[in-house]
Amino acid sequence: LPKAPVITTPLETVDALVEEVATFMCAVESYPQPEISWTRNKILIKLFDTRYSIRENGQLLTILSVEDSDDGIYCCTANNGVGGAVESCGALQVKMKPKITRPPINVKIIEGLKAVLPCTTMGNPKPSVSWIKGDSPLRENSRTAVLESGSLRIHNVQKEDAGQYRCVAKNSLGTAYSKVVKLEVEVFARILRAPESHNVTFGSFVTLHCTATGIPVPTITWIENGNAVSSGSIQESVKDRVIDSRLQLFITKPGLYTCIATNKHGEKFSTAKAAATVSIAEWSKPQKDNKGYCAQYRGEVCNAVLAKDALVFLNTSYADPEEAQELLVHTAWNELKVVSPLCRPAAEALLCNHVFQECSPGVVPTPIPICREYCLAVKELFCAKEWLAMEEKTHRGLYRSEMHLLSVPECSKLPSMHWDPTACARLPHLDYNKENPKTFPPMTSSKPSVDIPNLPSSSSSSFSVSPTYSMT
């Protein structure tokens, strides 16, 4: 007798790993024999799809090699024309052992920055990710966290964070380990012991010490008055990432000696500097109330203006007087590019001699101000038009910067050459040519490239750094 189909083994949920076999069974009793069709997520599975095996008149559906995308609801429908069609459904849950899809890579990072070691995983159930440093599980702390993605984030990287890391992805089906990667922490060059200034007698020997550290270990170079040290012997030793350099000098003139520690981070370099002065006792005896010291000018901007080997006053109210004063002239120098050919050399001479004042070595190194007459010559003769324009702008408050730019000297406050010819400095460039009183000897101007540090406001009585002047 005809019998409507009955599914005697309803479909069950099937768990399968990727690449495994998964079989659904839909045993049907009926007469005549039913036609059985299969769907996945309500889409008909075609009999000729070679990824599937349909056996026993459609009662067994096998996925021969499960893929991620096979996850879903599978239904069998049996129909033999007697009564209605019957259906049974079951889920295929594709399980997956943990797999690390984006493993960590070796990282070089500078101390203090944030490091992220990637570890992206796949798996079902979703794997939990932990990290191993060296041979021990890594404990999370205020700086270290395992992100939702599995990546390891380390804030404010410290030297002790360096080491070997690997991530571990784990679920109920298994565990996957990444390869071991290295976190290298690099540290900017830093001076541990700066050279000390010395006041010695002419012809003495002096040893300057400079100790620096960093990762990688920095190299130390010595600079004497702006140039590489030409004489003297250097001895170096390295121990436990600390480099110690000793420069031995035979002193015949005063000088500024700078120790520069440099190390490389990829394509970039980090440097640390420390300077010491070596003065000769007869030239200047440092006192408590010193405002600065005498040293040879070794900048670039005023090379053409100042006399060769000029002894200039370096104002110690700046952390790095040479660099600070050089920056002052450099910044103002750029503004002089647009002034008239008559004004420019005079203004440059005034600028350089005002910032790098001639220095009188003695018991207390003293700056020698520019003679009032020379200042007035620039103001009223060479640069009258520009000076007026600049004063107008100053009154309108157009110059606000307290840093980096030089104020115009107040000519009236400068000493006159008629009072004491030795109390003020002359500007040789402004001495009149008898044939043409408004000509100057030819001058070269150059724009050196200067690194711009953060400058402190000057507390010097010799010159101030407010408000700006421009001769345009």
């Epitope: 005697t8 083994t9 069950e12 099937v14 768990d15 399968a16 790993l17 495994e20 076999v21 079989t23 069974m25 045993a27 095996s53 349909i54 056996r55 026993e56 008149n57 009662q59 067994l60 096998t62 021969l64």
Partner: antibody, heavy 121, light 107 residues
Framework: EVQLVESGGGLVKPGGSLRLSCAAS????????MDWVRQAPGKGLEWVSS????????YYADSVRGRFTISRDNAKNSLYLQMNSLRAEDTAVYYC??????????????WGQGTLVTVSS | DIQMTQSPSSLSASVGDRVTITCRAS??????VNWYQQKPGKAPKLLIY???TLQSGVPSRFSGSGSGTDFTLTISSLQPEDFATYYC?????????FGQGTKLEIK
């Protein structure tokens, strides 16, 4: 009574061919999946091949795929195994078995007595 | 392919003993596991199908259990006629596979 009788075994040289037959009786042959299973001397059972009740699907073990061919003639109640490119490791007793669908997959509820195939030079 | 691993490969026991043979599948095979008995020179004989269903005509001292990957065949009280080789088989995949066999010998 269900009966399965194999024939066609014998001695054959490596590279040679042989055709095994299995005559079925006592049941509706056309309603069952049929399989071949072999057993090398002193070894365990090894499934060889399977064919659906109306020949709609065929499966082979990796070790014989491309060399053996399973077929059936429902009109004659017969199952066949054509064996080509025979190798020494094909030496075994070959059984035909009936596949029965149950609540969880199929099982071999009836077996023939087997036929010995010897591949040797 | 799905591998079926039987243990032990051989076993000595006495009449009346309780014996357990295990079979492990290389992946989950639901309950699609069958057990066969084979005596020397004879064809295999079906004992248990669908992991735990006793085939008609097989003594009740034979029982099967398991699901997923781990299966067992138990003989509750060994009889002299039970000394033979036992095989598990999976039919979850259309590419069926057998375990390597467990030879049960008289102690």
């Amino acid at each position: 009574e269900v009966q399965l009788v194999e024939s066609g075994g014998g001695l054959v040289k490596p590279g040679g061919s042989l055709r095994l037959s299995c005559a079925a009786s006592g049941f509706t042959f056309s309603s069952y999946t049929m399989d071949w299973v072999r057993q090398a001397p002193g070894k365990g059972l090894e499934w060889v091949s399977s064919i659906g009740s109306n020949g709609d699907y065929i499966y082979y073990a990796d070790s014989v795929r491309g060399r053996f061919t399973i077929s059936r003639d429902n009109a004659k109640n017969s199952l066949y195994l054509q064996m080509n490119s025979l190798r020494a490791e094909d030496t075994a007793v070959y059984y035909c078995a009936r596949g029965q669908l149950a609540v969880a997959g199929t099982h071999f509820d009836y077996w023939g007595q087997g036929t010995l195939v010897t591949v040797s030079s | 392919d799905i591998q079926m691993t039987q243990s032990p490969s051989s076993l000595s026991a006495s009449v009346g003993d309780r014996v357990t043979i295990t079979c492990r599948a290389s992946q989950k095979v639901n309950k699609y596991v069958n057990w066969y008995q084979q005596k020397p020179g004879k064809a295999p004989k079906l004992l248990i199908y669908a992991a735990s269903t006793l085939q008609s005509g097989v003594p009740s001292r034979f029982s099967g259990s398991g699901s997923g990957t781990d299966f067992t065949l138990t003989i509750s009280s060994l009889q002299p006629e039970d000394f033979a080789t036992y095989y598990c088989q999976q039919s979850y995949s259309p590419l069926s596979t057998f375990g390597q066999g467990t030879k049960l010998e008289i102690k």
